[in-house]
Interface confidence: medium
């Protein structure tokens, strides 16, 4: 399970974020519209969604989360662009199981190392580790068959940002699960 | 039915280690996490970290990085838990308890739904 | 790291009475909420997880119910074996944390 929970050392966990800004808690601010937003947690050491009244609130929050991570993790673009570019198997492909301690109940899939395949589990919506996917697609392009197949495997998966690529977690998508911060 | 037997109390000096056991029965061992966590006398109750049983993965809460260390042996269907460079303020009641490994469809169990008796650890000089 | 607060520090009851504790987390933490009861020299006994449901073999006087950063443990009607500590406990994210407890004393 999750060898790479938010607590233990990791490769980027361990290192101090970019700017003083990303040590900022999470601000919603005063106003009351709902724009999704992402902040780095310094606790977790991770970009996360959180939900951004549309003013005021503080530095640490991004349009995006490809630029939160891009300016609060240290060595991410270096990290993403080597993964992008290898076609070996990601590490935490290896990972086993690991639903989480919520209890959302959602689908999702990891890859198997004993079956050498991409397979269903549940998913309990927070903690984890990255052997977590959406789709069963996203799964086999970067643990079953990475590099190879018809797009850019990887490289497809980084452009359309549709997980997170870095230690200590689960894609973030928090579909039952916002922080109001 | 489900089992989770500690070790007995320890008494130790400043600057020592403890080892307590959790041996577990009445359920597949490596198919669910332990959870270690501990009650200092009069006080709440405080999480210090998990084992996976089936692979030795641990998650250790960062107030005691680097002075706990989770173990299991399969062969007995036991947990450790050691904590080294003991303090007097770690004197508490350490428990055992379990946690779910892999969730089904329908929500059946939960974490923490079965615990230790505790082991007293005293530290005194 | 997420704080958990819960109010009444103690409270002294009767027989039969309704009674309220709650547990507030300083961020949001969804349903990812569990309540234990302990007596003193036991270990705490699993009541409610995922914020309202009853584990196993608990009598249904006890009922959990909140979502997000409020939530609350009710006893609808106090039996004597109930009169101990209560605690609550967020499983949303490392590290794990409890509440400071409610002790729950004979009036």
């Known amino acids: 399970l999750s060898e790479e929970a938010d607590d233990t050392d990791s490769e980027l966990g361990s290192m101090k974020p970019l700017h003083t800004f990303c040590a900022m808690k999470a601000d919603d601010g005063p106003c009351k519209a709902m724009i999704r937003s992402y902040f780095f947690n310094m606790y977790t050491h991770q970009c996360e969604e959180f939900i951004y009244g549309g003013c005021e609130g503080n530095e640490n929050r991004f349009d995006t989360l490809e630029e939160c991570k891009k300016t609060c993790i240290p060595g991410y673009e270096k990290t993403a662009v080597k993964a992008a570019s290898g076609a070996e198997r990601p590490d935490f492909c290896f990972l086993e199981e690991d639903p989480g301690l919520c209890r959302g109940y959602m689908k999702r899939y990891l890859y198997n190392n004993q079956t050498k395949q991409c397979e269903r589990f549940v998913y309990g919506g927070c903690l984890g580790n990255r052997n977590n996917f959406e789709t069963l697609d996203e799964c086999k392009k970067i643990c079953e068959n990475p590099g190879g197949g018809s797009g850019g495997g990887l490289n497809d998966i980084f452009e359309a940002q549709k997980i997170e690529w870095h230690e200590g977690g689960p894609p973030h998508h928090h579909h039952h699960h916002h922080h109001h911060h | 039915q489900v089992q989770l037997v500690q070790s007995g109390a320890e008494v130790k000096k400043p600057g020592a280690s403890v080892k307590v056991s959790c041996k577990a029965s009445?359920?597949?061992?490596?198919?669910?996490?332990m959870h270690w966590v501990r009650q200092a006398p009069g006080q709440g109750l405080e999480w210090m970290g998990w084992?996976?049983?089936?692979?030795?993965?641990?998650n250790y809460a960062q107030k005691f990085q680097g002075r706990v260390t989770m173990t299991r042996d399969t062969s007995i269907s036991t947990a450790y838990m050691e904590l080294s460079r003991l303090r007097s303020d770690d004197t508490a009641v350490y428990y055992c308890?379990?946690?779910?490994?892999?969730?089904?469809?329908?929500?059946?169990?939960?974490?923490?739904?079965?615990w230790g008796q505790g082991t007293l650890v005293t530290v005194s000089s | 790291a997420i704080q958990l607060t819960q109010s009444p520090s103690s409270l002294s009851a009767s027989v039969g009475d309704r009674v309220t504790i709650t547990c507030r987390a300083s961020?949001?933490?969804?349903?990812?909420l569990a309540w234990y009861q302990q007596k003193p020299g036991k270990a705490p006994k699993l009541l409610i997880y995922?914020?309202?449901t009853l584990q196993s073999g608990v009598p249904s006087r006890f009922s959990g119910s909140g979502s997000g950063t409020d939530f609350t443990l009710t006893i609808s009607s106090l039996q004597p074996e109930d009169f101990a500590t209560y605690y609550c406990?967020?499983?949303?994210?490392?590290?794990?944390?409890f509440g400071q407890g409610t002790k729950l004393e004979i009036k």
């Open positions: 308890a379990r946690g779910i490994a892999r969730l089904q469809w329908l929500p059946t169990e939960a974490d923490f739904d079965y």
């Open positions: 009445g359920y597949t061992f490596t198919g669910y996490y």
């Open positions: 084992i996976n049983p089936n692979s030795g993965g641990t």
């Open positions: 961020q949001g933490i969804s349903s990812s």
């Open positions: 995922a914020a309202s």
């Open positions: 406990q967020q499983l949303d994210s490392y590290p794990l944390s």
